[in-house]
Interface confidence: low
C-alpha cells in the first residue's frame, strides 16, 4: 500500500467571524473611500491573513434611492486558495458572499479553468437572510476525485448585469504516476540497437523512471521522466517494462515483448485447386512469419519423370494472396511442387512437397508428310500423312481433323472431315472441278485439336490430266 506523503489540506471555515445569523458588520466603509457611481475596487481584509488589505474583485453598489445610505461593497469572501489531496478522496470547498437584500434573483455559478460547470456536479447554494443582507454560501463537492478534477475553480455572481468573481481555488489531485507514453512491442533485428520510450506524470512531480528487462532492473539510478532506453541489441526475445516512481509510490507499465526477427517457418498445406493441360493453380497456408512481414514467395516445380533431367523450375510471386497459377507446364505430366517464402531475414525452408498432374492437352505438333493427289477414275482426292512425331504425347490421340478448302472463280468453301486415330489416309470426294483444293490436317486428342499442317494445294482440272502435290512437311531423314 502506498501511504500519503503529505497531510490533506483542511478546508477553511466558511466564515472567519460569527456564523450566519449574527454576521459581523463589514467595517470597510470606515475607510474613507471616494465613492462614485458604478463599481470600483474596494479594500477588504483577507480572512486568511487578518489585517492585510487586498484588492478583490468587488462591486460597490449605487446609492440607495433614499440617497441617504451607502451599501457595503460586494465581494466574495476569501476562502482556501489551494487544496492538495489524493486520488479517490472526497473534497468539498465553497465561496461565500453577503448580498444586500435589495438585490433579487442572485445566482452563483461555478467555473473550472474558464468553463462553466453545468449539469451533474454537486453544487449546493445556501441562503442565510438577515435584516439587511443575505449571506450566500455556494458549496462544491467532488466524490472520489480523479486527476481530471485538477484545476482552478471560481464562483461567479451576476448583479445588475455586472459580474462578481471569486478568487480561484486550486485543486491539486495527487496520485501514483500516470503513464502518458509506454514502451511499445517491437520486432527487431538480432544484435541491432533500438530505443524504448517511457513517460509518466504526477502530480506530485518529479517522476523517476526505472527500466526492467526480463524482471531485472536495467538502470541502477532512476532517470527523470521522460526516459529513453537504448538497447544495444538482443539475441533472444525479451520483455521490457518501466517503473514510474513519485512521492505517492510506483506504477508499472505494461510489459512489452521485443521479438527477434527470424527466418520464416515453411508454408504448410499446399493444395491443388485446378489443373489444366499447361497450368496448375495452387494455394498454401503461410508459416510463422518470424516476426517480419513476408516479402515474396517462391514456387518450386520439379517434373516427376524418369526421363526428365530433374531440373527445378522456380516461379517467384508476391507473398499475398497465398495462391499462384503455375503456367508453361507440359500436358499430361506429373509434377512435385513446393513453396518457400522470405522475409527481410531470409528464405524459409520449402514446404512439404505435393504431387500434381496436368490434364490432357491438345497436340502440340501437326501431322507430317501430308501428300495429296487426284484419283480421276474415282473422282476423289487421296490424302496421306504420317502421325506427328513427339517425345511425349499431350494426351491420347483420338483422331485427325482434315480441312479442305475449294476455290474456283470467286467461290470458296471449307469442309471438315474427322477420321479415327488409326488412319493415316483419307479420301474426299471432288467438290468442284476446274478449282484448287487446299488440304490441312490436325491431330486431335481429348484435350483438343492440335495445330494444322502447312497447306497442300492441288488443282482439280475440268477433265483429263493430273496435278500431283508434294508433301507439306518432310519426315525427319526424308528431307
Amino acid at each position: 500500500a502506498i501511504t500519503e506523503a503529505r497531510e490533506e489540506a483542511k478546508p477553511y471555515p466558511l466564515f472567519p467571524g460569527p456564523l450566519p445569523g449574527s454576521l459581523q458588520t463589514d467595517h470597510t466603509s470606515l475607510l474613507s473611500l471616494p465613492h462614485t457611481s458604478g463599481y470600483q475596487p474596494a479594500l477588504m481584509f483577507s480572512p486568511t491573513q487578518p489585517g492585510r488589505p487586498y484588492t478583490g474583485n468587488v462591486a460597490i453598489p449605487r446609492v440607495t434611492s433614499a440617497g441617504s445610505k451607502l451599501l457595503p461593497p460586494l465581494a466574495f469572501k476569501h476562502t482556501v486558495g489551494h487544496i492538495i489531496l489524493s486520488e479517490h478522496k472526497d473534497v468539498k470547498f465553497n465561496c461565500s458572499i453577503s448580498v444586500p437584500n435589495i438585490y433579487q434573483d442572485t445566482t452563483i455559478s461555478w467555473w473550472k479553468d474558464g468553463k462553466e460547470l453545468l449539469g451533474a456536479h454537486h453544487a449546493i447554494t445556501q441562503f442565510y437572510p438577515d435584516d439587511e443582507v443575505t449571506a450566500i454560501i455556494a458549496s462544491f463537492s467532488i466524490t472520489s476525485v480523479q486527476r481530471s478534477d485538477n484545476g482552478s475553480y471560481i464562483c461567479k455572481m451576476k448583479i445588475n448585469n455586472e459580474e462578481i468573481v471569486s478568487d480561484p481555488i486550486y485543486i491539486e489531485v495527487q496520485g501514483l504516476p500516470h503513464f502518458t507514453k509506454q514502451p511499445e512491442s517491437m520486432n527487431v533485428t538480432r544484435n541491432t540497437a533500438f530505443n524504448l520510450t517511457c513517460q509518466a506524470v504526477g502530480p506530485p512531480e518529479p517522476v523517476n523512471i526505472f527500466w526492467v528487462q526480463n524482471s531485472s532492473r536495467v538502470n541502477e539510478q532512476p532517470e527523470k521522466s521522460p526516459s529513453v532506453l537504448t538497447v544495444p541489441g538482443l539475441t533472444e526475445m525479451a520483455v521490457f517494462s518501466c517503473e514510474a516512481h513519485n512521492d505517492k509510490g510506483l506504477t508499472v507499465s505494461k510489459g512489452v515483448q521485443i521479438n527477434i526477427k527470424a527466418i520464416p517457418s515453411p508454408p504448410t498445406e499446399v493444395s491443388i485447386h485446378n489443373s489444366t493441360a499447361h497450368s496448375i493453380l495452387i494455394s498454401w497456408v503461410p508459416g510463422f512469419d518470424g516476426y517480419s512481414p513476408f516479402r515474396n514467395c517462391s514456387v518450386q516445380v520439379k517434373e516427376v519423370d524418369p526421363l526428365s533431367n530433374g531440373s527445378v523450375m522456380i516461379f517467384n510471386t508476391s507473398a499475398s494472396p497465398h495462391m499462384y497459377q503455375i503456367k508453361q507446364l507440359q500436358a499430361l505430366a506429373n509434377y512435385s511442387i513446393g513453396v518457400s517464402c522470405m522475409n527481410e531475414i531470409g528464405w524459409s525452408a520449402v514446404s512439404p512437397w505435393i504431387l500434381a498432374s496436368t490434364t490432357e492437352g491438345a497436340p502440340s505438333v501437326a501431322p507430317l508428310n501430308v501428300t495429296v493427289f487426284l484419283n480421276e477414275s474415282r473422282d476423289n482426292v487421296d490424302i496421306r500423312w504420317m502421325k506427328p512425331l513427339t517425345k511425349r504425347q499431350a494426351g491420347e490421340l483420338v483422331g485427325y481433323r482434315i480441312s479442305h478448302v475449294w476455290q474456283s472463280a470467286g467461290i470458296s468453301k471449307e469442309l471438315l472431315e474427322e477420321v479415327g486415330q488409326n488412319n493415316s489416309r483419307a479420301q474426299i470426294s471432288v467438290q468442284v472441278h476446274n478449282a484448287t483444293c487446299t488440304v490441312r490436317i490436325a491431330a486431335v486428342t481429348k484435350g483438343g485439336v492440335g495445330p494444322f499442317s502447312d497447306p497442300v494445294k492441288i488443282f482439280i482440272p475440268a477433265h483429263g490430266w493430273v496435278d500431283h502435290a508434294p508433301s507439306s512437311t518432310p519426315a525427319p531423314g526424308n528431307a
Epitope: 538480432r190 533472444e236 527477434i260 527466418i263 510463422f288 516476426y291 528464405w347
Partner: antibody
Framework: QVQLQQSGPELVKPGASVKLSCKAS????????INWVKQRPGLGLEWIGW????????KYNEKFKGKATLAVDTSSSTASMELHSLTSEDSAVYFC?????????????WGPGTTLTVSS | ENVLTQSPTTVAASPGEKITITCSAS???????LHWYQQKPGFSPKLLIY???NLASGVPARFSGSGSGTSYSLTIGTMEAEDAATYYC?????????FGAGTKLELK
C-alpha cells in the same frame, strides 16, 4: 539440399585440446545459427552453445563456458568448436545443428556427429 | 534452467498401437517454443515436430503433437516398426536450450 558435414572421429589424450569442424552447404550460411550438441553414450542431448555466422555472436551454456570455443569461417561456410583440457567426461558424440533462431529455437538440420574419445 | 521431464522413460508397443509420450517443463513455455526430435541408434537426431504441433517436412501424418503451458505430448496414432527410436522434447524459450532425457520406444 541442406547438408552439415562433420569432421571424422578423434582419439586424444587427457589434458589436450581438439578442434571439431562442421561444413555447411545448400543454404545461406550466414542466415542461420550453428549449434553444437553433446551426447554421451546412452545419455541424452546437451546443448553447448551457438554461433551466429553473420556477426560471429556466440551464446554458451554456462556449463560449457571455458570448455568450448566456437568459431566460424564464412568464406568456407565452416563452423568449428575447440574443446580444451579434455577429460574422459568429454568423450561423447558431438553434433552440429542448424538453428532456426530465435523466438522459437529449434534445430532443423543436424550433422552426422563426430565421435570424440579421450583416453591415455 | 528450464528442466524438461519426459515420461515414460521406455515404452514397448506393437504395430498398430497408439503411443503417447509426455514432456513436462519446470517453467511455463509458450507452445511456440516446444519441439520434438526422433533419434535412431547410430544416427543424428531428426526434427519431428516444431512449435508443439507442426510436422517437419517428410514426417508421416500418424505423428501429432499438442500441449500448452508446462505440459506437452507427442502421439503416434498407429505405431509402425520404423517408429522404434528415442524421442526427445526440447524447449527454445530460454538459454540454456534444454532437451528432455528422452523416451525410448521399442517394438514389441
Amino acid at each position: 539440399q541442406v547438408q552439415l558435414q562433420q569432421s571424422g572421429p578423434e582419439l586424444v589424450k587427457p589434458g589436450a585440446s581438439v578442434k571439431l569442424s562442421c561444413k555447411a552447404s545448400g543454404y545461406t550460411f550466414t542466415t542461420y545459427d550453428i549449434n553444437w550438441v553433446k551426447q554421451r553414450p546412452g545419455l541424452g542431448l546437451e546443448w553447448i552453445g551457438w554461433i551466429y555466422p553473420r556477426d560471429g555472436y556466440t551464446k554458451y551454456n554456462e556449463k560449457f563456458k571455458g570448455k568450448a570455443t566456437l568459431a566460424v569461417d564464412t568464406s568456407s561456410s565452416t563452423a568449428s568448436m575447440e574443446l580444451h583440457s579434455l577429460t574422459s567426461e568429454d568423450s561423447a558424440v558431438y553434433f552440429c545443428a542448424r538453428g532456426y533462431y530465435d523466438n522459437l529455437y529449434y534445430f532443423d538440420n543436424w550433422g552426422p556427429g563426430t565421435t570424440l574419445t579421450v583416453s591415455s | 534452467e528450464n528442466v524438461l521431464t519426459q515420461s515414460p522413460t521406455t515404452v514397448a508397443a506393437s504395430p498398430g498401437e497408439k503411443i503417447t509420450i509426455t514432456c513436462s517443463a519446470s517453467s511455463i513455455i509458450s507452445s511456440n517454443y516446444l519441439h520434438w526430435y526422433q533419434q535412431k541408434p547410430g544416427f543424428s537426431p531428426k526434427l519431428l515436430i516444431y512449435r508443439t504441433s507442426n510436422l517437419a517436412s517428410g514426417v508421416p501424418a500418424r505423428f501429432s503433437g499438442s500441449g500448452s503451458g508446462t505440459s506437452y505430448s507427442l502421439t503416434i496414432g498407429t505405431m509402425e516398426a520404423e517408429d522404434a527410436a528415442t524421442y526427445y522434447c526440447q524447449q527454445g524459450r530460454s538459454v540454456p536450450l534444454t532437451f528432455g532425457a528422452g523416451t525410448k520406444l521399442e517394438l514389441k
